[in-house]
């Protein structure tokens, strides 16, 4: 852009330098030239002379009109005509912008991941503004009414040592440009009620060898939270659908859990857990693969109508993906939920 | 209540420094945004620099390169060093808290008198 440039003259624009994407505007050139009667004044947009709606105001001062501007940045400058000089004489040049008010930020909310010492807030910007936009976290505490506040642009992390005075906060995000300022909802947040636990991690898998095999997914967490609730899913690799099962675990020891699958197939497995009783959840833990060993007898038998099932607390359900490259987005396939697990072995799936 | 106090103002030539402090009282300073601003004779206020309650500092076009704003949590003191001074830098500079934008700083104190002349 034009930062620092040496006019002699003056350029202005109305409505403004950052205006409304859409308006339209008049860009005003002055010429203020020692020894020089401009025969012409002219207009650039990007260093591109302008050929239309330019008007000669007086013998000073012209004037370019954009209808419905909508780009959102420009360089423009303008020049002098002036007899005897072969070259035009540059005036005055003004970067200008257009962009949109800021919608008001939606969707806040606020984590903290188990040993970082950190609270994350994240939100949701809305539409482009295509200007310089602020956003401001202001995070109130509920006992002392001391409000802190933060800049940042669409998530900020802000280190619990710096709440250590209240467990109750009132946190909201404030967008600001020069088009216009909103406010996000106000979110009460309890630092106890918003701790993610540390990251599950499944280790190993295996295959038993029985008449029929079981497959045990061992898996672990760092988690210093006591009662923990979790969500293992899988599928085929060939499958869109993925079976969740629900688990109680206590982390104090690897989890083992077993599982009654197809044999000779390639599973994706995957955990995610959350405080018991609380509403945020782990991101889903990375994919483990694991394949199925090859099937001894003649059998083709079906998991879902397998006569190993019995009715227990667990909880298994169908969820598919939209995408197979996507399968970290799921959904709800059902409001079908088969409760079942395995009659034989020793049930280890709940901690 | 909130209480600031600034100090450090005088008179300076164009390319002489100067340092501003900001004397605050009633509020936990450490975990608080602070912003100082400025009233040119004649004018509104324009904020000048802010630093949020993270310590992300923030610069007006205008001093960015030349003005450098920071707290010292230990003297409950906000301090603004203005390098390569300008006459348009001329004004009487407040202290306040809260960050620049949206509505939310507010300022207490008297304020501090510079004046940039050869």
């Known amino acids: 852009g034009i930062t620092s440039i040496n006019c002699s003259g003056d350029m202005w624009v109305e409505p403004g330098e950052i205006f409304q994407m859409g308006m339209n505007v008049s860009i005003y050139c002055q010429e203020a030239l020692k020894h020089c009667r401009p025969r012409n004044l002219y207009f650039y947009k990007n260093g591109f002379k302008e050929e239309f709606d330019i008007t000669r105001i007086n013998r000073t001062t012209a004037r370019i009109w954009y209808k419905g501007f909508s780009e959102p940045h420009a360089y423009m400058h303008c020049t002098a005509e002036c007899p005897g000089h072969f070259q035009e004489t540059l005036i005055c040049g003004k970067d200008i912008s257009s962009g949109h008010p800021p919608d008001a930020p939606s969707n806040l909310t606020c984590v903290i991941y188990e040993y970082s010492g950190n609270m994350t807030c994240t939100w949701n910007t809305g539409k482009p503004t295509y200007i310089d936009t602020k956003y401001i976290v202001h995070v109130k505490s509920l006992e002392t009414e001391e409000e802190q506040q933060y800049l940042a642009s669409s998530y900020v992390k802000i280190s619990t040592d710096s709440l250590q005075g209240s467990r109750k906060y009132l946190v909201w995000v404030q967008a600001v440009n020069s088009l216009g300022m909103e406010n996000s909802q106000q979110l009460h947040v309890h630092l106890d009620d918003i701790v993610i636990p540390s990251a599950s991690i499944i280790s190993r898998a295996e295959t038993t060898n029985d008449t029929v095999p079981k497959t045990i997914v061992y898996w672990k967490s760092k988690t210093m939270i006591e009662k923990v609730f979790c969500e293992m899913r899988y599928k085929t690799t060939t499958n869109q659908t993925w079976s969740v099962k629900e688990f109680d675990a206590n982390f104090t020891y690897v989890q083992q859990s077993e599982f009654y699958l197809e044999p000779d197939s390639k599973y994706v497995f995957q955990v995610r857990c959350q405080e018991t009783g609380k509403r945020n959840w782990q991101p889903w833990s990375s994919p483990f693969v694991h394949q199925t060993s090859q099937e001894t007898g003649k059998r083709n038998w079906q998991p879902w109508s397998s006569p190993f099932v019995h009715q227990t607390s667990q909880t298994v359900s169908q969820v598919t993906a939209k995408s197979s490259h996507e399968p970290q987005k799921m959904e709800m396939l059902s409001a079908t939920i088969f409760r079942g697990h395995p009659a034989s072995g020793n049930h280890q799936d709940i901690g | 209540q909130v209480q600031l106090q600034e100090s450090g103002g005088g008179l300076v030539q164009p390319g002489g420094s100067l340092r501003l402090s900001c004397a605050t009282s009633g509020f936990t300073f450490s975990s608080g945004a602070m912003t100082w601003v400025r009233q040119a004779p004649g004018k509104g206020l324009d904020w000048v620099s802010g630093i949020d309650s993270g310590g992300t500092t923030v610069y007006a076009d205008s001093v960015k390169g030349r003005f450098t704003i920071s707290k010292d949590n230990a003297k409950n003191t906000l301090y603004l060093q203005m390098n390569s001074l300008k006459t348009e830098d001329t004004a009487v500079y407040y202290c306040?808290?809260?960050?620049?934008?949206?509505?939310?700083?507010?300022?207490t104190g008297q304020g501090t008198q510079v004046t940039v002349s050869s």
């Open positions: 306040a808290t809260g960050l620049p934008w949206g509505n939310t700083w507010r300022t």
